[in-house]
């Protein structure tokens, strides 16, 4: 059996202000059961951008439709990108629990956010 | 076993059209993106297009992008390519192959079929 | 772009390590072509990910920018170019290739 693996693609993307950022992810397995979570920075101040069972984030939408079955397709489209959305973006699965325990994280991808073309 | 099988490759002229096709078993095919990858003679690799399960999302590389068309039936397991509008750098030996987790890795490829165009 | 050394020599029953760095990728792949012409095989997938069929003197590790693939107790039958891969949809996907001959 195959180790878990989060791959995130991309080193790095680079998206004009305004427009939307597309960050990917992938997961290798659905076992073992839990969530899919994207941060921005890693460490204790790290900042939650998306859960994928709860919470409420409006400028952010799952690529793939999360209710398709055996999807391990984890990429999140961030839109309306402000200088301010610039750093580093983990995607991370949790084991299931109470609460929920951190398994693994991706490697990574830094947004950096290019002036709005006038 | 998984096993692609790649056909409709031919010889045929600037500007003509060729539709190749790749027939998948041995895995559910339903279920994997679906890419097209070519080898000009005596040059390397080089991706040309991918597909999504569903069939709903495509992928083309610059090269070929608005020439080009793939497609799938998950209903026959097959994988297909539109080629129109073909010129003498798209002769190469074009490869079906069955993308893993993530689509721009390939863990099995067909054996291949060869484009020639000509005049 | 995926950069790769054009060509590697190995002695029989040595060990070869070939390189592939650069691009945007996070992870990477290896394919090997025994002749032009003939399929692709891969090799490696995902950094480390060896599909069942292929011998265990083939290992993938990637550091950083860079991914090497190391075949161990090298064969007469290993003589081939080999293809690194990217993860990166803006990589091209594929570098140039390496030729390995085995002496």
């Known amino acids: 059996e195959e180790e878990l693996q989060v791959i995130q693609p991309e080193k790095s993307v680079s998206v004009a202000a305004g427009e939307s950022a597309t960050l990917n992810c992938t997961a290798t397995s659905l076992i073992p059961v839990g969530p899919i979570q994207w941060f921005r920075g890693v460490g204790p101040g790290r900042e939650l951008i998306y859960h994928q069972k709860e919470g409420h984030f409006p400028r952010v939408t799952p690529v793939s439709d999360p209710t398709k079955r055996n999807n391990m397709d984890f990429s999140i489209r961030i839109s309306n990108i402000t200088p301010a959305d610039a750093g580093t973006y983990y995607c991370v699965k949790f084991r299931k629990g109470s609460p929920d325990v951190e398994l693994k994280s991706g490697a990574g991808t830094e947004l950096s956010v290019r002036a709005k073309p006038s | 076993d998984v096993q692609l099988v790649e056909s409709g490759g031919g010889v045929v002229r600037p500007g003509e059209s060729l539709r190749l096709s790749c027939e998948a078993s041995g895995f559910t095919f339903r279920n994997y993106y679906m890419t097209w990858v070519r080898q000009a003679p005596g040059e390397g690799l080089e991706w040309v297009s991918t597909?999504?399960?569903?069939?709903?999302?495509?992928y083309y590389a610059d090269s070929v992008k608005g020439r080009f068309t793939i497609s799938r039936d998950n209903s026959k397991n097959s994988l297909y390519l539109q080629m129109n509008s073909l010129r003498a750098d798209d002769t190469a030996i074009y490869y079906c192959?069955?993308?893993?987790?993530?689509?721009?890795?390939?863990?099995?490829w067909g054996l291949g079929t060869l484009v020639t165009v000509s005049s | 772009a995926l950069t790769q050394p054009a060509s590697v020599s190995a002695n029989l029953g040595g060990t070869v390590e070939i390189t592939c760095s650069g691009g945007n990728s996070n992870h990477y792949g290896w394919y090997q072509q025994k002749s032009p012409g003939s399929a692709p095989v891969t090799l490696i997938?995902?950094?480390?990910n060896r599909p069942s069929n292929i011998p265990s003197r083939f290992s993938g590790s990637t550091s950083g920018s860079t991914t090497t693939l190391t075949i161990t107790g090298v064969q007469a039958e290993d003589e081939a170019v080999y293809y690194c891969g990217g993860s990166s949809t803006g990589d091209g996907i594929f570098g140039a290739g390496t030729t390995l001959t085995v002496l």
């Open positions: 597909i999504s399960d569903t069939g709903d999302t495509a």
């Open positions: 192959a069955k993308s893993w987790i993530w689509w721009t890795f390939f863990d099995y």
């Open positions: 997938y995902a950094d480390t």
